[in-house]
């Protein structure tokens, strides 16, 4: 056959299903690889062809598009499935070609099982909520395509095992849920069971997705320096290591770009003949707000070093600040012999 | 002298993997957060992933999440970008640039080319 | 994501003449930076923090502009001033960059 531009094997879109569910997939070519749509290439007279390599096997062989119930069929650039099978994992390839044109990509599709608590090895998808922001909602996700708008579902919401009804703050409308007031309690798996019928059938979609509750941006503010601050000095004699921990609170804000980072005498401490080494850590709060450490080292310091100006900064979306560190050079306690000396006059 | 240097670039299939790779010296390269930046042919720049200076948070663009992960080696003083599912519009130049506070991008790479072609 | 637009995308000046480079950011922004790229070659820090000159960056650039409204000036081209240049925006992920803006020779 003629050469056929291979978009390989795309992992991207690592595709997960639940057994005994429906599943619509649509060929990935027109939607992150070819310049046109599906309905460009038909009326072009391009065919879609589809195929498939059963998992730990190396043959590509065609799909049966003749099952029993049309368990498997495909709809325009669609691969539909009524319902999946654990046996259906495995990797498919939709091509598209004509005599004189051929274009494939090739996507793993994992057909994973779940218990009655809807745990599974699915990757969930995670939805942030603002903490007491006043009402929020989640709209149970990938439902479209499913069925007509005549269709009127069925839609039952759970948290984790239980089913949401009188929850005191969550409540379900529909397909979407809404949080009244989100706190750290609504932390946790939300799932969605979306009942449909179709042909006589009735079928079942099942949705989990993580919701994580965060620092509003009502509450946000510039970034805090707690460390360092006008009550701790750095004394030290030359010889000894020089310690100074930058501790910095962020409030969450999203997507934010949160910054640390020292000056020594206005530069960045590459920037001058000192031997500084810069240990940094990072811990976030239940509704991630975040704190960074960095802690200034000097092995030797030196008197120089001493009259050196140490610049804690932090930056955020919210504002920049900065903080001095108090840094000192000890006073050798006076010897008590030579005082003693100069008590008794002795010269 | 600060350098920059990247490698590992070259073509490979639509589908496929490379590694990237970008050796630093001339500075403490742990105290520096580092970056990919990637540019197009005729094209502007484009930021494809960055990573703390200890290495425990990296930050990428939507259009390369899951696909590509940035890793450092800070007793080797390299920087790395491991790049999967690679797609012709991945085809571009690959820079590594350091970071230090609110300097940002202040010393890159000569870049390093990937060509992502069938 | 905070989207970027330069203009123009490209600018006409001779040599001695003053260069104006715009920088229009979707959303505010605490600070800008800008790049300038000559052809094979990788960008060039010139102004971080809005107004600050990079190290070894001739006075003759400059930088202004607050919350989504930035400017590159160079007072008076010189000839080795023709090239790309890029706005970047440091304050949210993912970091973004302008289009690019290129100043050519009349």
């Known amino acids: 056959s003629e050469r056929c531009d291979d978009w390989g094997l795309d992992t991207m879109r690592q595709i997960q299903v639940f057994e005994d569910e429906p599943a619509r997939i649509k060929c990935p070519l027109f939607e992150h690889f070819l310049k046109f749509n599906y309905s460009t290439a038909h009326s072009a007279g391009l065919t879609l062809i589809w195929y498939w390599t059963r998992q730990d096997r190396d043959l590509e062989e065609p799909i049966n598009f003749r099952l029993p119930e049309n368990r498997i069929s495909k709809e325009k650039d669609v691969l539909w499935f009524r319902p999946t099978l654990l046996n259906d994992t495995g990797n498919y390839t939709c091509m598209l070609r004509n005599t004189t044109y051929c274009s494939k990509v090739a996507f793993p599709l994992e057909v994973v099982q779940k218990d009655s608590c809807f745990n599974s090895p699915m990757k969930l998808p995670v939805h942030k909520l603002y903490i007491e922001y006043g009402i929020q909602r989640i709209t149970c996700p990938n439902v479209d395509g499913y069925f007509p708008s005549s269709v009127k579902p069925t839609i039952t919401w759970y948290m984790g095992c239980y089913k949401i009804q009188n929850f005191n703050n969550v409540i379900p409308e529909g397909m979407n849920l809404s949080f009244l007031i989100a706190l750290i309690s609504n932390n946790g798996n939300y799932t969605c069971v979306v009942t449909y019928p179709e042909n006589g059938r009735t079928f079942h979609l099942t949705r989990t997705l993580t919701v994580k509750v965060v620092g509003s941006p009502k509450n946000a503010v510039p970034p805090v320096i707690h460390s360092p601050n006008d009550h701790v000095v750095y004394e030290k004699e030359p010889g000894e290591e020089l310690l100074i921990p930058c501790t910095v609170y962020f409030s969450f804000l999203m997507d934010s770009r949160n910054e640390v980072w020292w000056t020594i005498d206005g530069k960045k401490p590459d920037d001058i003949t000192i031997d500084v080494t810069i240990n940094e850590s990072i811990s976030h709060s239940r509704t991630e707000d975040e704190t960074r450490t960095q802690i200034l080292s000097i092995k030797k310091v030196t008197s120089e070093d001493l009259k050196r100006s140490y610049v804690c900064h932090a930056r955020s979306a919210k504002g920049e600040v900065a903080k001095a560190a108090k840094v000192k050079q000890k006073v050798p306690a006076p010897r008590y012999t030579v005082e003693l000396a100069c008590g008794f006059g002795a010269t | 002298e600060v350098q920059l240097v990247e490698s590992g670039g070259g073509l490979v299939q639509p589908g496929g993997s490379l590694r990237l790779s970008c050796a630093a010296s001339g500075f403490t390269f742990s105290s520096y957060a580092m970056s990919w930046v990637r540019q197009a042919p005729g094209k502007g720049l484009v930021w494809v992933a960055e990573?703390?200076?200890?290495?425990?948070?990296?930050y990428y663009p939507d259009t390369v999440t899951g696909r590509f992960t940035i890793s450092r080696d800070n007793a080797k003083n390299t920087l790395y970008l491991q790049m999967n599912s690679l797609r012709a519009e991945d085809t571009a130049v690959y820079y590594c640039?350091?970071?230090?506070?609110?300097?940002?991008?202040?010393?890159w790479g000569q870049g390093t080319t990937v060509t992502v072609s069938s | 994501e905070i989207v970027l637009t330069q203009s123009p995308a490209t600018l006409s000046l001779s040599p001695g003449e003053r260069a104006t480079l715009s920088c229009s950011a979707s959303s505010s922004v605490s600070y800008m930076y800008w790049y300038q790229q000559k052809p094979g070659q990788a960008p060039r820090l010139l102004i971080y923090?809005?107004?600050n000159l990079a190290s070894g960056i001739p006075a003759r650039f400059s930088g202004s502009g607050s919350g989504t409204d930035f400017t590159l000036t160079i007072s008076s081209l010189e000839p080795e001033d023709f090239a790309v240049y890029y706005c970047q925006q440091w304050s949210s992920y993912p970091l973004t960059f302008g289009q690019g803006t290129k100043l050519e020779i009349k």
């Open positions: 923090d809005t107004s």
């Open positions: 640039a350091r970071s230090y506070g609110n300097y940002p991008f202040d010393y």
């Open positions: 990573i703390s200076r200890g290495g425990s948070h990296t």
